[in-house]
Amino acid sequence: ARNGDRCPLGPGRCCRLHTVHASLEDLGWADWVLSPREVQVTMCIGACPSQFREANMHAQIKMNLHRLKPDTVPAPCCVPASYNPMVLIQKTDTGVSLQTYDDLLAKDCHCV
Amino acid sequence: ARNGDRCPLGPGRCCRLHTVHASLEDLGWADWVLSPREVQVTMCIGACPSQFREANMHAQIKMNLHRLKPDTVPAPCCVPASYNPMVLIQKTDTGVSLQTYDDLLAKDCHCV
């Protein structure tokens, strides 16, 4: 693994993709989505220590300033670098529609 | 302002663009950047309460799951939605070069 992918806090503690099982009720979608009724939501969770999966130069700056001014500048944050599409079958006024959402499931993660 | 831009926590508490004044020493650039010697770093800082500047459906899901499972799923995070370029004059082996960085200064912010 690249240096930027080795977690100094221990396995699984740093920014990475997690899967959270959620019902449509959990998501607040129960009244408009027909299928699936249970979703495997992939999201980015974990700490962003120095040099770990830094997305860009902004993330580097943010980490440097966070170390200097921790009360003012937060550490970089673990967010999706890209997304996987998700297909929902949903209720419409005229029946049932097939809808793809491109920004719903995280595909991989980085620190910004 | 759209509903998603009104901060329920009070003025200036939610995710927005901040300017942090930083020297090259602060940024760890003193040994390779000649100019500017001081940088106005724009970055995204602040809380992401429900429905505030949600970037996409992933952010909506994350907030819903955070409310249900706060110990497992963190709240959405304030990150750059886009960047402003910044020009640095830097030292090279052969002299001095002008380099533009596209991912250095946050231009606007959203919650992901």
Epitope: S35, R37, Q40, P85, M86, V87, V96, L98, T100, D102 | -
Partner: antibody
């Protein structure tokens, strides 16, 4: 693991009806919908329609509208596809397919051959 | 409805060679495209979804690319078990539609 087990082969006369069953296991039946797909001998795949076990909502291919009915029985985790007024060109292998959140599906039944012949 | 056209209808390839299969949609389907492999007497097997994401357990020699109306399935080095019929499927709109298939046969 997810399994879809379909009923056995059928031979029907033109004008008759056929009802193919698809018993699901390995997941919560009402969490996902079921697609039906058919394949005539030596031909490609044709999508027939979809049903959600959760609410019974359906969406059928236009060319089969009026002849096809998809139903589910949540007590037995079984989906059914009935096709009426059978013609010789309905001779095909009929597959049930569980839907997924990604669009494509790895979960297919083994297929049921329906032969329509006088 | 969206018409999916696959080419060629038959592809003759030697084991170990690369195979490139094409699928064209009559209108944009974004990345809402899947590829299936089918062998005689068997149900189709999902290879790729989202135009380029390999399904669980699918070997790395299978790769998908494209978006909009033009898509490609590439098998980098054909193994004996890869000789089969391949179908593309769009799930961007009802009705879901399949291509006519490409038969990959031994040269």
């Amino acid at each position: 693991q997810v399994q879809l087990v379909q009923s056995g082969a059928e031979v029907k006369k033109p004008g008759a009806s056929v009802k193919v069953s698809c018993k699901a296991s390995g997941y919560t039946f009402t969490d996902y919908g079921i697609f039906w797909v058919r394949q005539a001998p030596g031909q490609g795949l044709e999508w027939m329609g979809w049903i959600t076990a959760y609410s019974g909502d359906t969406h059928y291919a236009q060319k089969l509208q009026g002849r096809v009915t998809m139903t589910t029985d949540t007590s037995t985790s079984t989906a059914y596809m009935e096709l009426r007024s059978l013609r010789s060109d309905d001779t095909a292998v009929y597959y049930c397919v569980r839907d997924t959140q990604y669009g494509g599906s790895p979960y297919w039944g083994q297929g049921t051959l329906v032969t329509v012949s006088s | 409805e969206i018409v999916m056209t696959q080419s060629p209808a038959t592809l003759s390839v030697s084991p170990g060679e690369r195979a490139t299969l094409s699928c064209r949609a009559s209108q944009s389907v974004s990345s809402n495209l899947a590829w299936y492999q089918q062998k005689p007497g068997q149900a189709p097997r999902l290879l790729i979804y989202g135009a380029s994401t390999r399904a669980t357990g699918i070997p790395a020699r299978f790769s998908g690319s494209g978006s909009g109306t033009e898509f490609t399935l590439t098998i980098s080095s054909l193994q004996s078990e890869d000789f089969a019929v391949y179908y593309c499927q769009q799930y961007n709109n009802w009705p879901i539609t399949f291509g006519g298939g490409t038969k990959v046969e031994i040269k």
